[in-house]
């Protein structure tokens, strides 16, 4: 028997087609990817095969103006247009509060929506009751298949998920749910969640009973064969792992931001196991067309957003690299413009002795979500910006000994290369790492700009001396493991609107060109 | 749980034609096809035939004059007919989900007059 | 038709040996090999799908490898209750069985 799974995973508002780079749709011609276009394949597979599943693996929340504006009404909408069979809970479900993923998704979704490892307490616990589920049995054909979900445990320090949440680990939680499938007699099990690619991996080790892993929060791009874009495969698709009872288990992912559509084929053996499993992401490019009824409405929702913020702030003459391939590995210039500007917002010469209050600046590289293209005539957007700083946050004045910034620039590389968000932008800094240290000493040179000082310059940091430092809102609050910023942070005054702040500076300076200029060695 | 079982007579006459019933449970006709497999005492497995889950069949060359498989879906039964049997068929005859991942305990079957 | 070629056809061994048994394809069968253990009895029963993957209950002593047209069954430490009769299984056309390994105790 054979199952096809088409999949998607980090789709966030990309619900118009984008650039190749997922950034703003400026040649449409070349574009990519939408609601629009994953309709059309999914349709096209649905009438060409018999049993198919429609899943998403998280994270359909947060990314470009429409979450801006409709908060999740539009996810709920077109994900029920588009008739997926399940969802499971990304981290980002959660980044307007429990409130902002209840009322305009878990109450207005046509399909089930999973998280075994998210338990509910207190209030809260009556209310969300039935709103999502641990595993749901889905019919396909003749067949019944288990779809089981998890949700990183790490989204209370990525998002909001507020206090009557309890986030399990993943394996812990998986394996009862599970348990319970086998003994209702679905032989056939698809862990369908939002924990990166390397649980996903030890789920498939480690959970016994789940055919299929397919994940999502990686951004995992994986392909059997030559690439048709511009990623760059982690592994084969599927990537097999070796379950710890012998049994050869499937895992993919569809890299992000509904670019491609993941298409795996799975055929089952009469006891439930997989015999073989087969397939490729389909990159969704402009060969495939738009659906006319979806495009439709997109084009009706989208008169609001126009309302909302199309209007030009400023220009920029050079490419804005806010990658994640860069700005999660290196100094990116678009962290460097949003540092600049982050500084100028707080720009008060209250005391001759020094030029400035706060000099410095620290951005995580995993809040800078897209690129902006310079060759869309220059122009930037408040939607632009949207993409780039999606998550509503606020950018914050904290006062930090020495000793706990030198403690944040070592998490910001304690796991290098593993394209987490947690790598430091910086402004106002100069870091260099040597990472053939081991993790905790690989900062071998810090300095800071002064403030006490009528011409900046950069001195050593001090450990004992109280910093002034700008940044956003989610490292004060001990996002991306930065526990030591929120436990050992001396003051904090909440600051103005992150897209508003750089806004400001790009509507002030007109023109700006960034460079990448050795903040980051 | 998934499980197969053969049925039928352990004993045939020479010309005569074999009925053998294998009966289902734990999972649908309609998704999965039915293995016929036979062997001779002391010899080896030798594959008959196999009726697919959208009902079609495919056999062995050697047996294709004499054997025909059917099945009842609604009654989760498959039935193989082998005709003119002859003595050098006396063998355990078994069925077998289409991936052999089951197999049924297998009948033995005498040709004898 | 695809021919499945088995070898040993027997062997003798002790408890604790390890034990090889190969299977080689006349064409390319693509890891669509099953591998049977068949007690005195008759009973068959699958140990190995797909090439390599252990079915439900099957001790660990038990791997199966290869690709293409080679495929090996091992028994790591060979167990009293192994002393049994193998056969391979080719499923990517019309089924076809290796001739059967018989392992017997030394």
């Known amino acids: 028997w054979e199952l096809t799974i088409l999949h998607t995973n980090d789709v966030h508002s990309r619900l118009e087609q984008t650039s190749e780079d997922s950034s703003k749709c400026v040649n449409a011609s070349r574009c990519m990817g939408g609601v629009a276009r994953l309709f059309t394949k999914v349709q096209q597979i649905r009438r060409a095969e018999p049993n198919v599943l429609l899943l998403d693996a998280g994270d359909q929340y947060q990314g470009t103006i429409w979450f801006t504006v409709y908060k999740g009404a539009e996810v709920a909408h077109f994900m029920n247009a588009l008739r997926y069979d399940a969802m499971a809970l990304g981290n980002h479900e959660f980044d307007n509060g429990v409130e902002g993923l209840i009322e305009p998704l878990l109450k207005e979704a046509k399909f089930p929506i999973l998280s075994a490892n998210i338990k509910a307490k207190g209030p809260l616990a009556s209310q969300i009751s039935g709103l999502y589920l641990p595993y749901k049995v889905l019919p396909v054909g003749d067949e019944v298949v288990g779809i089981v979900g998890y949700t990183s445990k790490e989204t209370p320090f990525l998002s909001n998920p507020g206090t009557n949440l309890v986030f399990e680990d993943e394996i812990t939680a998986l394996q009862p749910e599970v348990d319970k499938l086998k003994t209702l007699n679905v032989n056939k099990i698809i862990a369908l969640g939002h924990s990166g690619f390397e649980m996903d991996k030890l789920i498939a080790q480690k959970v016994r009973g789940v055919d299929v892993v397919v994940g999502g929060h990686s951004n995992t791009f994986l392909y059997t064969g030559n690439p048709p874009s511009k990623e760059v495969p982690a592994g084969k698709y599927p990537f097999i792992v070796t379950s710890d009872d012998g049994r050869k288990v499937p895992v993919v992912q569809a890299y992000a931001f509904g670019k491609y559509l993941g298409y795996l084929k799975i055929e089952f053996d009469e006891r439930g196991n997989v015999i073989s499993s087969h397939g490729n992401p389909i990159l969704l490019n402009s060969s495939i067309p738009e659906d006319p009824s979806i495009k439709a409405d997109i084009n009706k929702w989208r008169i609001k957003l126009d309302n909302y913020s199309t209007q030009e702030l400023g220009k920029t003459i050079v490419y804005l690299d806010g990658s994640s391939q860069s700005c999660r590995f290196r100094e990116c210039n678009m962290g460097n413009l949003i540092c600049d500007a982050m500084i100028n917002n707080n720009l008060r010469h209250t005391d001759e002795m020094f030029w400035n209050h706060v000099s410095m600046c620290i951005l995580n590289g995993g809040g800078i979500r897209s690129p902006i293209d310079e060759r869309n005539n220059g122009t930037i957007t408040w939607e632009n910006l949207a993409a780039v700083l999606p998550f509503g946050g606020t950018f914050d004045l904290v006062q930090l000994k020495g000793s706990t910034l030198k403690k944040a620039f070592e998490h910001s590389v304690h796991r290098y290369g593993q394209s987490t968000g947690e790598f430091l932008q910086v402004g106002g800094i100069h870091v260099v790492y040597d990472l053939s240290r081991k993790p905790g000493d690989r900062v071998v040179k810090l300095d800071v700009l002064c403030t006490k000082c009528r011409v900046p310059s950069y001195d050593p940091l001090k450990m004992d001396e109280v910093y002034k430092v700008i940044l956003p809102n989610f490292l004060a609050n001990g996002g991306d493991g930065f526990q030591m910023i929120k436990d050992e942070l001396l003051r904090h005054d909440s600051g103005d609107q992150d897209i508003n702040v750089v806004s400001t500076y790009i509507s002030k300076m007109k023109v700006i060109y960034p460079a990448v200029e050795g903040r980051i060695k | 749980e998934v499980t197969l079982k053969e049925s039928g007579p352990v004993l045939v006459k020479p010309t005569e034609t074999l009925t053998l019933t294998c009966t289902v449970s734990?999972?649908?006709?309609?998704?999965?096809?039915i293995q016929w497999v036979r062997q001779p005492p002391g010899k080896l497995l030798e594959w008959l035939g196999v009726?697919?889950?959208?009902?079609?069949?495919d056999y062995n060359a050697a047996f294709i004059s004499r054997l025909t498989i059917s099945k009842d879906t609604s009654k989760s039964q498959v039935v193989l007919t082998m005709t003119n049997m002859d003595p050098v068929d006396t063998a355990t005859y078994y069925c077998?989900?289409?991936?052999?991942?089951?197999w049924g305990q297998g009948t033995l079957v005498t040709v004898s007059s | 038709d695809i021919q499945m070629t088995q070898s040993p056809s027997s062997l003798s061994a002790s408890v604790g040996d390890r034990v090889t048994i190969t299977c080689r394809a006349s064409?390319?069968?693509?890891?669509?090999l099953n591998w049977l253990q068949q007690k005195p009895g008759g009973a068959i029963k699958r140990l190995i799908y797909a090439t390599s993957s252990l079915d439900s209950g099957v001790p660990k002593r038990f791997s199966g490898s290869g690709s293409g047209t080679e495929y090996t069954l091992t028994i790591s430490s060979l167990q009293p209750e192994d002393f049994a009769t193998y056969y391979c299984?080719?499923?990517?056309?019309?089924?076809?069985f290796g001739g059967g390994t018989k392992v017997e105790i030394k």
């Open positions: 064409q390319d069968i693509g890891d669509r």
């Open positions: 299984l080719q499923y990517a056309g019309s089924w076809t």
């Open positions: 077998a989900g289409q991936y052999g991942s089951v």
């Open positions: 009726i697919w889950s959208g009902g079609s069949a």
């Open positions: 734990g999972f649908s006709l309609k998704s999965y096809g």
